[in-house]
Structure formats: structure tokens, C-alpha cells
């Protein structure tokens, strides 16, 4: 199905023309332009950048480009009362203080408005007490501490290393454990790759570097004061006490030099095993408190940040579709950064900019896509996906009726090893087919396809000769579109070698050292990986907007549904006695999956054979494809997470970044052996199985012949 069938355009106006127009040199130029000063959400600098992007998108040829503003809760350090952590002696004197800011990188010493490291939305407070080291502060780490080691964190300040899971989950876990404060730090074991120098001589984290980030547990709510509704002029706002997802204890991030000073004196219990030890020259004792001579010393936090309602700005560009203007394909990525945003987000924003320019060139030559393409530069992603969520809340009725697909465009790179894709199963075939047509940028794969290098470097664990595609989790702007609204979504970026590089994110993530030079010197000097990501993201948008039949394959959903049903059944079967006692059966779910598989197969045959020249029939089939993702939405949402409504996928309750399949059943089964009322717990498992069964069956029926 040629894309050129869509709007009777001349053959040169096809995907190839669009892809050929994308230039690495332009992406490089745009990245440089976007990274010279900080663009923190809610600041004048970020408003000015929004206006610049609006102006340039208009110049590129989009039909309209609008700024949409919202007044949302943001969080900033107090400029005159800095945040820090002290070691205090028995007299209350501060004998060591953590740093007040990161040593600025060369060439940026005189840049103003670099926000010092802080944990966004931390409450104010000055807790004082003994320290407990809690490893990564994951659910399993607290289980180990509390259940196995009998260490009580109540009234203690906990120190946790960054990595493995979203920082908001760490804080939530610490709160539930009774901690009075949380210190987050970057251990070299997670953020310093062996054999690589620290920035500015390499891409590793220096000891004074610190990861900023929000510590919310929003569960998809958007602005904490206006859950479910846009934060506009007439919005009703909750009081701070009722705000969604705010932490209740002070939290502050530090680098590994400061962590060294806090951890080197730790006493109490030894670490349980090597998985709790990082690579600082400290014992990694768990505590509580300091050892021997230092046992009278305590740790004190001084947190003075404030949360305030602040105006944010999205940029929304429209390229109207020629045939189906009421069908929207969205390409969106955020613009706000913690500091310079060399990778996050501007490596993504620069790619979006070049994609818009290329589409604009085609439009200037008389071409239009079949469907409408919306381009978005989101604000306040770093503060909880606020810009995208508020816009989607404001436009939810349109989006749920007209939204075909959402392609996310945050950081284009987190490494330079191979491609990484997370998407709905509906897009698997689109991604495979597209990457087979693109050239690999990888050394040693000259003249080979991207599909080939990707498959070689990141093979699928299930299917030989195919690359790995992961589940969508959260922690980025696709969340509201996929998890709340059920719009087919995907994301792609270049990544590291997960086999050899065990660090969590890239080492300089959310630090002052995430600069243009970091990218240009160490990650992608030729901007060839950026160009490849532009081709993947842009190519997906092109196909989704321009192919006559939507490039979705519902059979791939059938395959994963079977895999997920097997997985959750196997988890449940760890409790065979209880399943028998409480009559827990997955038969209905497997039956629904079987029905889905059969109906999807028949639908695919009809899709292959129907008369594509019949516009009514074409629209009907395309609508069935578009609405399939929507059919997995439960309007009631998941238990205690009303804005996570997708029954097949949700962000893990233990790690927002990770996707979990059949999350309702998974959460009902989690740690079920420790529940005080097993009968009620297994009753909830049965309820969740029935919801999943109904949803899969209902989704299958949307693919049946309509009459």
C-alpha cells in the first residue's frame, strides 16, 4: 500500500522525499540553539523558547501554531535560603555540609539561573536523626530491611542510591517505612562506567554532579491541584493538603562526593550482600547511625523549597490532513529542561524541529498528509508530565474520538549502541517494516539496514531474527495518551549496550553537565544517531498519517495477550493451594485471548481483501483499527489509580518507568502471602481476572464484522 495513494500526489512526494530532507547538520544546529541557556519550566527563558519554536514552525510551513497555557503547581528552591544536608555533632554544630550547587562546566561559569540540585515538590523541613542506608529504596529493599534484618526506619533519615526504579517510588517506599527524610545519591557503581573519564573529559558523572528530578507519585493525574481537568483560568484547585501525589517528607539529592562523607561513618548492621554495595570507598553499612567515635553525630536536612502555581506553555502545531482531517497523528516531546537539556529533552526537541521542517518543505511543494498531524512542544514534563497531561485533559473528547496515534519524542539518545523501541503491539509491524528500509548508522553495518543492526545488537528474547520491542511504562509524555486515553503510542531512541553498561540512566542525566558539548564530543559527533532517530520517529508519523490503511496489525496484540496471560498465570501458580482453596481460575481469560486471536486473524484477512477504493468501507476498517487500543480502556481505571485505565498495560506500581502487563491482576497477586485477609485478597484476584477477561473479549468484539 503506497503512501502516495493517499492524496494523489506526485511520486516524489513520498516517504523517501520526506526522509531525504532530514539532515544531521540541521539537528546539530537546532540542538546547539536549544541548549545555550537553561529552560526550566515556568521561567521566562522557557516561555521565550516556546515563542521561538512557534515562530519557526510557522516559517517551516505548518497551517497553524498556537501556544496553550495552563497554571499548574511547580516547585523551586528558595533563592536566598539554599537546601543542604549537614552532619552535626552533639552540640548541634555543622561539621560537614553538602554542596549548594554543582561546579559549573567550563564555558558556563557565568550563566545565570542554573537551578541548584533539588527534589521537586519536596516539602520544607529540617528533620534530624540517624541515617539508614536502604540500597535503591525499592520495594524488595525495604522487605529485606524490615522483614529479614528487622531494621526499623521509623523516625530515621534514609539514604538511597538512584537507579533501577523511578525516584518517586523510592520516596513513597521510604514514607511508608516511616522515614522522616530521604537523601538520594548517585553511586559510581550506577553512574560511572568503567574506563570512561568524568565530564568534561568523558561522559561519566563527576563527584560533584547531581541528578535533579521530581519525586511525585501522580499516577497519571497531571497537575496535582486539578486532577482530571485542565488547569485553566476557571479550574477549581484543591488545597495543598488534598493535592495528588505530593511527598510528605523532605527529600534532597546529592552527588557521590557528598555521599562519601555521609556514608563513610555508617555503623550498625553490615550490608546483607554484595548487591547492596556500590563502588565508593565506604563500608555500605546499613545503620542505623554512625559508628564508634561518631555515634553521637547526626544528620540534619535543611529543605526550604516552595511549591507555587505557575504558568506553563505548550506549543501545538497543526498540519491539516487532506482526506481525513478529523484523524490525528501526534508527534510530541517536551521542551523544558532541568538545566541545559543537552540530551533531555533537547536532543529530542531538535529532532522534532527537523521533522517539522521536512514536513513543511513537502507542504510548500503542494503535498498534504492524508490525516492531520499535530506537533507538540510540551512544557513541564520534568514536573510530572504536566503540559501534555493538561492539554490532553482539555482536549480529551476530541482525542478519544479522533486520536489515531501518539509518537513520543523526548531524548533522542541515551547511548550510541543500538535502537530502543517501546510501543503498542499494534505498531510492531510498522516499526519492523520501517527499520528494514532505513540504513544503519552503526559501525560495522555499513550498507546494512537498521533492522539488521538492531536485531543483532538487541535480539528479541522470544523470536529469533527479530529485535526486542519493550512495553510502554511511563515517566514520559505518552502516558496520558496511552494509559489514560487508549491512543496507540510508541517511542524510539538510540540506547546503550545494556549487557555491558549496568548504570541506570546515562550518567549525566538531569545534571548541569548535560550540555551540547556532551553530545557533540562524546555521544554523536556526526549526529548520525540523531538522524536515524529522526528517520524512525518521522517515518512512523509519516506512515501513520499517510498510509491508506492504518499500519496497525491486531494479530501482534493477540500474540502478546497470550504471552501476558501465560506470565500472570505462572505468577499465580506459585500459590497452587490458595488457588484451589479459593477456586481461582484463569480459564476465562485464556478463552477470551483465544477468541481475540481468532477474531484478529479473520479481521486481518478482511483487511487484506476489502475494496480500498470504497471510502466508507476504508473508513470503517480504519476506525476498527484506531479504536482497538481504546477498547482496552476501563472507564473505572485501576484500583486506587483512576487515571491508569489501560487493562493490558500500566506503569508498574513499584517503578513508574517500567510497564506491567495485566497490572490489575499483577497488583492483586503481589505479596499476597503477606496479606492479613487471604480470602479478601484472593477475591480481589478473581475480580481482576474477570475485568481482564471482559476487556479482552470486548476488544475482540470490536474487530468482528460490524454486521
Amino acid at each position: 500500500k503506497s503512501s502516495s495513494e493517499a492524496t494523489n500526489i506526485t511520486p516524489k512526494h513520498n516517504m523517501k522525499a520526506f526522509l531525504d530532507e532530514l539532515k544531521a547538520e540541521n539537528i546539530k544546529k537546532f540542538l546547539h540553539n536549544f541548549t545555550q541557556i537553561p529552560h526550566l519550566a515556568g521561567t521566562e527563558q522557557n516561555f521565550q523558547l516556546a515563542k521561538q519554536i512557534q515562530s519557526q514552525w510557522k516559517e517551516f510551513g505548518l497551517d497553524s501554531v498556537e501556544l496553550t497555557h495552563y497554571d499548574v503547581l511547580l516547585s523551586y528552591p528558595n533563592k536566598t535560603h539554599p537546601n543542604y544536608i549537614s552532619i552535626i555533632n552533639e552540640d548541634g554544630n555543622e561539621i560537614f555540609n553538602t554542596s549548594l550547587f554543582e561546579p559549573p562546566p567550563a564555558g558556563y561559569e557565568n550563566v545565570s539561573d542554573i537551578v541548584p540540585p533539588f527534589s521537586a515538590f519536596s516539602p520544607q523541613g529540617m528533620p534530624e536523626g540517624d541515617l539508614v542506608y536502604v540500597n535503591y529504596a525499592r520495594t524488595e529493599d525495604f522487605f529485606k530491611l524490615e522483614r529479614d534484618m528487622k531494621i526499623n526506619c521509623s523516625g530515621k533519615i534514609v539514604i538511597a542510591r538512584y537507579g533501577k526504579v523511578f525516584r518517586g517510588n523510592k520516596v513513597k517506599n521510604a514514607q511508608l517505612a516511616g522515614a522522616t527524610g530521604v537523601i538520594l545519591y548517585s553511586d559510581p557503581d550506577d553512574y560511572f562506567a568503567p574506563g570512561v573519564k568524568s565530564y568534561p573529559d568523558g561522559w561519566n558523572l563527576p563527584g560533584g554532579g547531581v541528578q535533579r528530578g521530581n519525586i511525585l507519585n501522580l499516577n497519571g493525574a497531571g497537575d496535582p491541584l486539578t486532577p482530571g481537568y485542565p488547569a485553566n483560568e476557571y479550574a477549581y484547585r484543591r488545597g495543598m493538603a488534598e493535592a495528588v501525589g505530593l511527598p510528605s517528607i523532605p527529600v534532597h539529592p546529592i552527588g557521590y562526593y557528598d555521599a562519601q562523607k555521609l556514608l563513610e561513618k555508617m555503623g550498625g548492621s553490615a550490608s546483607p550482600d554484595s548487591s547492596w554495595r556500590g563502588s565508593l570507598k565506604v563500608p555500605y553499612n546499613v545503620g542505623p547511625g554512625f559508628t564508634g567515635n561518631f555515634s553521637t553525630q547526626k544528620v540534619k536536612m535543611h529543605i526550604h523549597s516552595t511549591s507555587e502555581v505557575t504558568r506553563i506553555y505548550n506549543v501545538i502545531g497543526t498540519l491539516r490532513g487532506a482526506v481525513e482531517p478529523d484523524r490525528y497523528v501526534i508527534l510530541g516531546g517536551h521542551r523544558d529542561s532541568w538545566v541545559f537539556g543537552g540530551i533531555d529533552p533537547q536532543s529530542g526537541a531538535a529532532v522534532v524541529h527537523e521533522i517539522v521542517r521536512s514536513f513543511g518543505m513537502l507542504k510548500k511543494e503542494g503535498w498534504r498528509p492524508r490525516r492531520t498531524i499535530l506537533f507538540a512542544s510540551w512544557d513541564a514534563e520534568e514536573f510530572g508530565l504536566l503540559g501534555s497531561t493538561e492539554w490532553a485533559e482539555e482536549n480529551s473528547r476530541l482525542l478519544q474520538e479522533r486520536g489515531v496515534a501518539y509518537i513520543n519524542a523526548d531524548s533522542s539518545i541515551e547511548g550510541n549502541y543500538t535502537l530502543r523501541v517501546d510501543c503498542t503491539p499494534l505498531m510492531y509491524s510498522l516499526v519492523y517494516n520501517l527499520t528494514k528500509e532505513l540504513e544503519s548508522p552503526d559501525e560495522g553495518f555499513e550498507g546494512k539496514s537498521l533492522y539488521e543492526s538492531w536485531t543483532k545488537k538487541s535480539p528479541s528474547p522470544e523470536f529469533s531474527g527479530m529485535p526486542r520491542i519493550s512495553k510502554l511504562g511511563s515517566g514520559n509524555d505518552f502516558e496520558v495518551f496511552f494509559q489514560r486515553l487508549g491512543i496507540a503510542s510508541g517511542r524510539a531512541r538510540y540506547t546503550k549496550n545494556w549487557e555491558t553498561n549496568k548504570f541506570s540512566s546515562y550518567p549525566l542525566y538531569h545534571s548541569v553537565y548535560e550540555t551540547y558539548e556532551l553530545v557533540e564530543k562524546f555521544y554523536d559527533p556526526m549526529f548520525k544517531y540523531h538522524l536515524t532517530v529522526a528517520q524512525v520517529r518521522g517515518g512512523m508519523v509519516f506512515e501513520l498519517a499517510n498510509s491508506v490503511v492504518l499500519p496497525f496489525d491486531c494479530r501482534d496484540y493477540a500474540v502478546v495477550l497470550r504471552k501476558y496471560a501465560d506470565k500472570i498465570y505462572n505468577i499465580s501458580m506459585k500459590h497452587p493451594q490458595e488457588m484451589k482453596t479459593y477456586s481461582v481460575s484463569f480459564d476465562s481469560l485464556f478463552s477470551a485471548v483465544k477468541n481475540f486471536t481468532e477474531i484478529a486473524s479473520k479481521f486481518s484477512e478482511r483487511l487484506r481483501d476489502f475494496d480500498k477504493s470504497n471510502p466508507i468501507l476504508l473508513r470503517m476498517m480504519n476506525d476498527q483499527l484506531m479504536f482497538l487500543e481504546r477498547a482496552f480502556i476501563d472507564p473505572l481505571g485501576l484500583p486506587d489509580r483512576p487515571f491508569y485505565r489501560h487493562v493490558i498495560y500500566a506503569p508498574s506500581s513499584h517503578n513508574k518507568y517500567a510497564g506491567e502487563s495485566f497490572p490489575g491482576i499483577y497488583d492483586a497477586l503481589f505479596d499476597i502471602e503477606s496479606k492479613v485477609d487471604p480470602s479478601q485478597a484472593w477475591g480481589e484476584v478473581k475480580r481482576q481476572i474477570s475485568i481482564a477477561t471482559f476487556t479482552v473479549q470486548a476488544a475482540a468484539e470490536t474487530l468482528s464484522e460490524v454486521a
Epitope: 555540609n97 554542596s99 561559569e109 563527584g207 562526593y257 562519601q260 567515635n293
Partner: antibody
């Protein structure tokens, strides 16, 4: 060229004050911890004070605690030592020194890799 | 009385090897704090000779080497030369003083 130049020394009476300055050039001053070290006539080197790059930490030798204050102005690439209640035993050559970068810890917990030529302070009635 | 103890003087003939010891305690060298060595000609700026126990800054000849064991450290100079005749200081951090400590200094004389 990396350089440290001290100034402000002189002859002063006991009990009076003096302010020493150290102008840094040839390196990114704002990213380094800085020390003051002195050498009394006929004696060895004695560490006086240190300040972290961001002034979050300042430490002093017991002999000067409560009388001397170390500070810095990162916008002027200058280190200071404010010396109050001076005593005869404070007579010395005062050196400023840059803290040494060495991987495992804040530089100001390490040695000193670049030194100035020194400025002489004489406390005498 | 310095916290770190060095011999007041050592001497050696040109071409010979000499060592200068630096003895501390469990709150400084013995607490795994690094030892650094300086060369100081009075009236000039001290010069860093060895950092982090055994590392040489660029420009320092490999005739100079450092080592550390337990609560002591030492500086070795091989192939003594006339220009080596000056004062040498060891330095470390002391956790009980929360301060940086120097040895009393060692005067090296090159005989000849």
C-alpha cells in the same frame, strides 16, 4: 598559565586586623576548593583554612579558629583570608593553594596542587 | 609538635637513594586518608611532588616515588641530584582534628 597571586600582607600591630587576597587565573576558579597555608620564620608549613568551591564548607586550624575567616568571590576569581585579633605567633608567609582533584572525594579533602608565591604578614608592636 | 612525624634531616650522596618517612596515627594516615608530598625551597612556592600516596603530577621526574602502609608513608628519591637539596613535607587529613595536617618537614642535604 595557572597562577595564584597573594596580596595584602604587611606589618600590623597585635590585636589589629588584616585581609589577604589571592587572585586566581588560568583555571576555572569556581570549581575548585582553596586553602590558606602559612610558614612562620624558621618553622614548617602549617595549614590554616580551607573553603569548598561553593562556600558550603569552611574549616580552620584550631590556632586560628574564631579569629580568621576564609571566603571567596567566584565572580572575581578571588580568595580571601580575613585575619582579626592578630597575635605575634601569626607572623608568617601566607600561601594560597588550590585543592587537588583526585577522584574519590571533594578536592578540598585532598592535597594542594598549585601554590602562590606567598605574602608576608608581620605582627609586631 | 606536628601530628605527622618526619625526620628533621636526611642526607645522601649524588646518585644515591634516600627515603623520608612520615608517621601518623589511626585518625589520619591509618584512617585511609591519602598522603601527599611537597618540595619547598624557602621563599618560593611549595611544589606538589606526590599525591594520593604514590602518584606523580606531570613534570615530576620518576626518581621520586611515594608509598603508604598502615599508619606510615614514605617518599623515596633515587639518583640524588644537587637540585634536590631542599625541604620536603608530607601532608594528610586528620578526622579527629577535622583538619589538614603537615609533617614538621625534612631537610634533605645532598653531600658533595
Amino acid at each position: 598559565e595557572v597562577q595564584l597571586v597573594e596580596s595584602g600582607g604587611g606589618v600590623v600591630q597585635p590585636g589589629r586586623s588584616l585581609r589577604l587576597s589571592c587572585a586566581a587565573s588560568g583555571f576555572t576558579f569556581i570549581t575548585y576548593g582553596m586553602h590558606w597555608v602559612r610558614q612562620a620564620p624558621g618553622k614548617g608549613l602549617e595549614w590554616v583554612a580551607v573553603v569548598s568551591f561553593d562556600e558550603s564548607n569552611k574549616y580552620y586550624a584550631d590556632s586560628v579558629k574564631g579569629r580568621f575567616t576564609i571566603s571567596r568571590d567566584n565572580s572575581k576569581n578571588t580568595l580571601y583570608l580575613q585575619m582579626n585579633s592578630l597575635r605575634a605567633e601569626d607572623t608568617a608567609v601566607y600561601y594560597c593553594a588550590r585543592a587537588l582533584r583526585d577522584g574519590n572525594n571533594w578536592d578540598y579533602f585532598n592535597g594542594m596542587d598549585v601554590w602562590g608565591q606567598g605574602t608576608t604578614v608581620t605582627v609586631s608592636s | 609538635q606536628s601530628v605527622l612525624t618526619q625526620p628533621p634531616s636526611v642526607s645522601g650522596a649524588p646518585g644515591q637513594r634516600v627515603t623520608i618517612s612520615c608517621t601518623g596515627s589511626s585518625s589520619n594516615i591509618g584512617a585511609d586518608y591519602d598522603v601527599h608530598w611537597y618540595q619547598h625551597l624557602p621563599g618560593t612556592a611549595p611544589k606538589l611532588l606526590i599525591y594520593g600516596n604514590s602518584n606523580r603530577p606531570s613534570g615530576v621526574p620518576d626518581r621520586f616515588s611515594g608509598s603508604k602502609s598502615g599508619t606510615s608513608a614514605s617518599l623515596a628519591i633515587t639518583g640524588l641530584q644537587a637540585e634536590d637539596e631542599t625541604d620536603y613535607y608530607c601532608q594528610s587529613y586528620d578526622s579527629s582534628l577535622s583538619g589538614w595536617v603537615f609533617g614538621g618537614g625534612t631537610k634533605l642535604t645532598v653531600l658533595g
